[in-house]
């Protein structure tokens, strides 16, 4: 299996909520010896490799904002300690998980990474990582909504969402 | 604070049976799959049991595997070691680690000392 | 099982100089490696993951690379609560294994 990340670049205005998607891709076993590790850390572009450090998401760490299911399975982060710091992982029966990140300030900007690892019986586990980078922006050059920008392309989309409230 | 505490450890006979506890705080320990790692006096490290956080899966080092069964009790923030038919190769400290898929063991008990003896 | 082999099994240096102790694996854990190091009478401490990444807290004096087989931990100016045991792990394939440990001590 591999994780598709469908945008590589959120650009957001200060005060906004983000969504922040991967997506699982491939033939995902849904046995009974197969569950899946899903978690959010923030990074740095590494010279050896990206997403190889994993530093906290608003002081919190990959630990604390952990999926942990079968399949394709749906579950989502009911941690008050994430929901404190305006912050909720979530995934679908669809392979899809994302991390919504609420009322950004300039500091949330840096690289964001989805970790996935598949959990095999008696099997050496399987990791794989997805990058992509949020730019929060302030001042007049700001955007009014969050705009993204797909992987494939550097065709960009607007989010239409207002300020403090929920998109995607 | 966030800790681990073993119990349990002291000097038993070959064949003999001891039952280890490690005691989790400070963290959701529902949340952390878990390990047993044991050291032989004035030895290395050696990786004894493993548990999900759900209770399974559960994997066993061959040279324990039949004789140690390694459960939790996620409502008392509790794992636990049965240890049967003990050997003399099995005198160690016997450490409780928090692990997680794709992660390491980042958080250790001081260990209980087994030791086995006649 | 996969094999670790720590080299030298001990360092005698002094408090400044800089300490480079070696893990080879018996066959290839990617990047999915760990240093710890381990005082007498304490449990061990998460120094490194995943070959190169100072877990929290880890001073910059430590430092670590490699991938497949061939690992380094290196402590650049050794400070007196430095001198300890250091041992590689691996998880890349069950069971997980340890090196047996390199000790540096003072000289």
């Known amino acids: 299996f591999k994780v598709a990340t469908p945008y590589s670049l959120y650009v957001c205005p200060e005060g906004q909520n983000v969504t922040l998607t991967c997506r699982l891709l491939g033939p995902v076993d849904k046995g009974h010896d197969v569950t899946f590790y899903k978690t959010w850390y923030r990074s740095s572009r590494g010279e050896v490799q990206t997403c190889s450090e994993r530093r906290p998401i608003r002081n919190l760490t990959f630990q604390d904002l952990h999926l942990h299911h079968g399949g394709h399975q749906a579950a989502n982060t009911s941690h008050d300690l994430a929901q404190r710091h305006g912050l909720e992982s979530a995934s679908d029966h669809h392979g899809n998980f994302s991390i919504t990140m609420r009322n950004l300030t300039l500091l949330d900007s840096g690289l964001y990474c989805c970790l996935v690892v598949e959990i095999r019986h008696h099997h050496s586990e399987h990791r794989v990582h997805g990058a992509m980078e949020l730019q929060v922006q302030t001042g007049k050059d700001a955007p009014s909504n969050c705009v993204v920008y797909p992987s494939s392309s550097q065709e960009s989309e607007n989010i239409t969402a207002h300020h403090h409230h929920h998109h995607h | 604070q966030v800790q681990l505490v073993e119990s349990g450890g002291g000097l038993v006979k070959p064949g003999g049976s001891l039952r280890l506890s490690c005691a989790a705080s400070?963290?959701?320990?529902?949340?952390?799959?878990m390990s047993w790692i044991r050291q032989a006096p004035g030895k290395g490290l050696e990786w004894v049991s493993y548990?999900?956080?759900?209770?399974?899966?559960?994997y066993y080092h061959d040279s324990v595997k039949g004789r140690f069964t390694i459960s939790r009790d996620n409502a008392k923030n509790s794992l636990y070691l049965q240890m049967n038919s003990l050997r003399a190769e099995d005198t160690a400290v016997y450490y409780c680690?928090?692990?997680?898929?794709?992660?390491?063991?980042?958080?250790w008990g001081r260990g209980t000392l087994v030791t086995v003896s006649s | 099982e996969i094999v670790l082999t720590q080299s030298p099994a001990t360092l005698s240096l002094s408090p400044g100089e800089r300490a480079t102790l070696s893990c080879r694996a018996s066959?290839?854990?990617?990047?999915?490696l760990a240093w710890y190091q381990q005082k007498p009478g304490q449990a061990p401490r998460l120094l490194i993951y995943?070959?190169?990444n100072r877990a929290t807290g880890i001073p910059a004096r430590f430092s670590a690379s490699g991938s497949g087989t061939d690992f380094t931990l290196t402590i650049s100016s050794l400070e007196p609560e430095d001198f300890a045991v250091y041992y590689c792990?691996?998880?890349?394939?069950?069971?997980?294994?340890f090196g047996q440990g390199t000790k540096v001590e003072i000289k």
């Open positions: 680690a928090r692990d997680l898929p794709g992660w390491y063991f980042d958080l």
């Open positions: 066959q290839s854990v990617s990047s999915y």
């Open positions: 400070g963290f959701t320990f529902s949340d952390y799959y």
């Open positions: 995943d070959a190169s």
């Open positions: 792990q691996q998880r890349n394939n069950w069971p997980r294994t």
């Open positions: 548990i999900s956080n759900s209770g399974s899966p559960i």
